[in-house]
Interface confidence: medium
Amino acid sequence: LQDLCSNCPAGTFCDNNRSQICSPCPPNSFSSAGGQRTCDICRQCKGVFKTRKECSSTSNAECDCISGYHCLGAECSMCEQDCKQGQELTKKGCKDCCFGTFNDQKRGICRPWTNCSLDGKSVLVNGTKERDVVCGPSPADLSPGASSATPPAPAREPGHSPQ
């Protein structure tokens, strides 16, 4: 018997109960490719998810996260709570970054300040919970022959800035 299912376009399914007749997908389902024997149930964007793109007969719904949450995983499979800048999400909720670390986003973890001295540079702007340090010129660049409008600030190691 010739397989008629290959003739069924996206948006339909091949109804084997009826001599392989193509039928449109039922409401709230879709088939994104031709020749499908079933339609897939549309994703529902509920709870912390909100609809970014409605389901159609040929494509699944796409979800975003409601305000205060952000997407994680492929196709926004999870929503994770936002934290403030200067915080990270732990099992107990949002916690301030430890001294010497920062987070400039509403998501992710606190990361250590850059160690300027590893690159032979000095700290130009101190780090905070929300911002990394800004490294300045190396001490060698600040020799007496170098022109500078203001005398250089003494180099500080990360970790000595007031919080």
Epitope: C8, P9, R18, S19, I21, S23, P24, C25
Partner: antibody, heavy 120, light 107 residues
Amino acid sequence: QVQLQESGPGLVKPSETLSLNCTVSGGSISNYYWSWIRQPAGKGLEWIGRIYTSGNTNYNPSLKSRVTMSVDTSKNQFSLKLTSVTAADTAVYYCARDGNWNYADAFDIWGQGTMVTVSS
Amino acid sequence: DIQMTQSPSSVSASVGDRVTITCRASQGISSWLAWFQQIPGKAPKLLIYTASGLQSGVPSRFSGSGSGTDFTLTISSLQPEDFATYYCQQTNSFPFTFGPGTKVDIK
């Protein structure tokens, strides 16, 4: 509610091509199959074929060599062309909606029909 | 092609009568059968789908039954507006085919 309206010439000469349009109003043409059915005077109903909104078609084998169906989703319209007509093609031509998945293609909405006479 | 036959080809009945029309398929079609009513000069109207499903807006005096090859349309109490021709149609396989019709007229 969804309504269908057939349009096209009522008289076609033998050996020429019969062309009919069906306009869908009050709803979207999308996600349905749409059929053409004809009925010679005083006789029964004959299914000609159907088309999906993507252009996928199924034709009655008895007419397949002469039938072409097309769809224009922007105009909410689908059409029938039947080539090399003879007097045997004289009939009332109906367009109808295949009643989607739960109706298993029973025709749930019909146009009022248009009479086509093949005569020189 | 699946051949559909109907009996009787015509029936004379009075208002209030119970009318039964049968439809037979040349091969099994499960429940993939519809019934239509056609008044002269009008388009057919869907009454029953998948053998026994009553189409929305159709009076409950119409009912359908059967599966496989033998099907029945019953009008429990004939009304003046029911005098018409009734067709069965199979949607089990291509090409979709109709029965020849049963004419219900006034006795």
